[in-house]
Interface confidence: low
């Protein structure tokens, strides 16, 4: 009997080992399939969303990453409250699982748009470096299903890059005009969103708890219209110390005013940045490494 029990334990352990190996193989197969797909895409056809089949619906890119899909690209997600799924770029580098909510790279998209466009989202949802805004509605659906960290990757025209990260990034609903809420800052670019860098400007430059404004829907704290003056939609105060949806200028100091892509604590108001990626991931995200 003792021998029998030991044999059972040995067999159970072997089964577990085999299960783990099968899982590892499944992950490898998924990765190879994706790599094959991406090699195909790299041959010229970037205009494809990676199809995960109807296996399940993913609430964000972290779930896709944890399900073994380790390749960056466009995927379809459906946050819990969202009525429909939508395409989004998933950044599977930098620890993986990042849902990209905004990208600026080359000025190919017009970011001087009205309320409806910013609400629903706009831009290039097919090309790797395509510029887009995911949409305030989608940001609300995403950030209310759990607590998210926002990471902002910034690059200037001198090949320097910095980042800013905020815990507990939340976007309110339509009734609250998609109000911005951010938590604790960390990073290398300075805290331009909360305006904590300078006691004099915080009352008018902080974006914390600001409602979203566009040229046709003015919710800022300025006697003029920030969105109209800065030609973009953003969580304007009076007006900004950060504006990542600003006018794209093809050079650092070509802006005639502070309406460029601005992150004050890095390069000041009159330097327009070369590229920006805004991406989110659950606060408690842990990569599922098998």
């Amino acid at each position: 009997l003792e021998d029998c029990a030991q044999e059972q334990m040995r067999l159970r352990a072997q089964v577990r080992l085999l299960e783990t190996r099968v899982k590892q193989q499944q992950v490898k197969i998924k990765q190879l399939l994706q790599e094959n797909e991406v090699q195909f895409l790299d041959k010229g056809d970037e205009n494809t969303v990676i199809d995960l089949g109807s296996k399940r619906q993913y609430a964000d890119c972290s779930e896709i990453f944890n399900d073994g899909y380790k390749l960056s690209g466009f995927y379809k997600i459906k946050p819990l409250q969202s009525p429909a799924e939508f395409s989004v770029y998933c950044d599977m580098s930098d620890g993986g699982g990042w849902t990209v909510i905004q990208r600026r790279s080359d000025g190919s998209e017009n970011f001087n748009r009205g309320w409806k466009d910013y609400e629903n989202g706009f831009g290039n949802f097919v090309q790797k470096h395509g510029e887009y805004w995911l949409g305030n509605k989608n940001l609300h659906f995403l950030t209310t299903q759990e607590d998210y960290t926002l990471k902002i990757d910034l690059a200037d025209f001198e090949k320097n890059s910095r980042y800013a990260q905020y815990k507990n990034f939340k976007v309110g609903d339509e009734k609250n005009f998609y109000e911005l809420n951010i938590g604790e800052y960390s990073g290398t670019a300075g805290d331009s969103l909360a305006g904590n860098f300078h006691p004099e400007v915080q009352w008018w430059a902080s974006h914390q708890r600001m409602k979203f404004s566009t040229w046709d829907r003015d919710h800022d704290n300025y006697e003029g219209n920030c969105a109209e003056e800065d030609q973009s939609g953003w969580w304007f105060n009076r007006c900004h110390s950060a504006n990542l949806n600003g006018v794209y200028y093809s050079g650092p100091y070509t802006a005639k005013t502070d309406n460029g892509i601005v992150w004050y604590t890095w390069h000041g108001w009159w330097y327009s940045l070369k590229s920006v990626v805004m991406k989110i991931r659950p606060n408690d995200f842990i990569p599922n490494v098998i």
């Epitope: 300078h198 004099e200 400007v201 006697e223 003029g224 007006c239 502070d258």
Partner: antibody, heavy 115, light 107 residues
């Protein structure tokens, strides 16, 4: 490009008043507070006060209350500083400067008070 | 008022050297300190804000450090064009106050 263009040098007699200007360009004038700083020859810098161009709210260094008066004309994007009851102690270079961090400065207006 | 003290009025250095300009606040100002460079006959130019952040276009040989009451501007690999007066300034509370300045002389 942001520019703060200040008016030319002034020579005044003791007891008189003077009004100097600072014309701003390259940004939305009503957005950012304008500060004024005094520098006497061979001496350090002294903050005089600031004005919010959007509503003309002012804040002064106690030392310059009654001496300096800050105003703006938003239609011409120009800030002004008037100094009254001039004495030789007021002879200095006066700068207008944009905050925060006083990162943009005018070229300065030299005031000489002499009988 | 917060008093900003730059104890050294003059500092002498040679091209290629490293020099540190110090500034002491009479009370805690956090990191709300800026540094300015003023060359003869010119307006001051902002170098550093928030104690350690360089403004755009400022060479990386200029480094700011410190918090609370003690602050330092370090210029490594001093160049002849660094001949100037350097001022610290606090913007933690009003009135804003400046240090008395430190003149850097190149031997």
């Amino acid at each position: 490009e942001v520019q703060l263009q200040q008016s030319g040098p002034e020579l005044e007699k003791p007891g008189a008043s003077v009004k100097m200007s600072c014309k701003a360009s390259g940004y939305t004038f009503t957005r950012y507070w304008m500060h004024w700083v005094k520098q006497r020859p061979g001496q350090g810098l002294e903050w005089i006060g600031m004005i919010d161009p959007s509503d003309s709210y002012t804040s002064y260094n106690q030392k310059f209350k009654g001496k300096a008066t800050l105003t703006v004309d938003t239609s011409s994007s120009t800030a002004y500083m008037q100094l009254s009851s001039l004495t030789s102690e007021d002879s200095a270079v006066y700068y207008c400067t944009l905050r925060p961090g006083l990162d943009y400065w005018g070229q300065g207006t030299t005031l000489t008070v002499s009988s | 008022d917060i008093v900003m003290t730059q104890s050294q009025k003059f500092m002498s250095t040679s091209v290629g050297d490293r020099v540190s300009v110090t500034c002491k606040a009479s009370q805690n100002v956090g990191t709300n300190v800026a540094w300015y460079q003023q060359k003869p006959g010119q307006s001051p130019k902002a170098l550093i804000y928030s104690a350690s952040y360089r403004y755009s276009g400022v060479p990386d040989r200029f480094t700011g450090s410190g918090s609370g009451t003690d602050f330092t501007l370090t210029i490594s690999n001093v160049q002849s064009e660094d001949l100037a007066e350097y001022f610290c300034q606090q913007y933690n509370s009003y009135p804003l106050t400046f240090g008395g300045g430190t003149k850097l002389e190149i031997k």
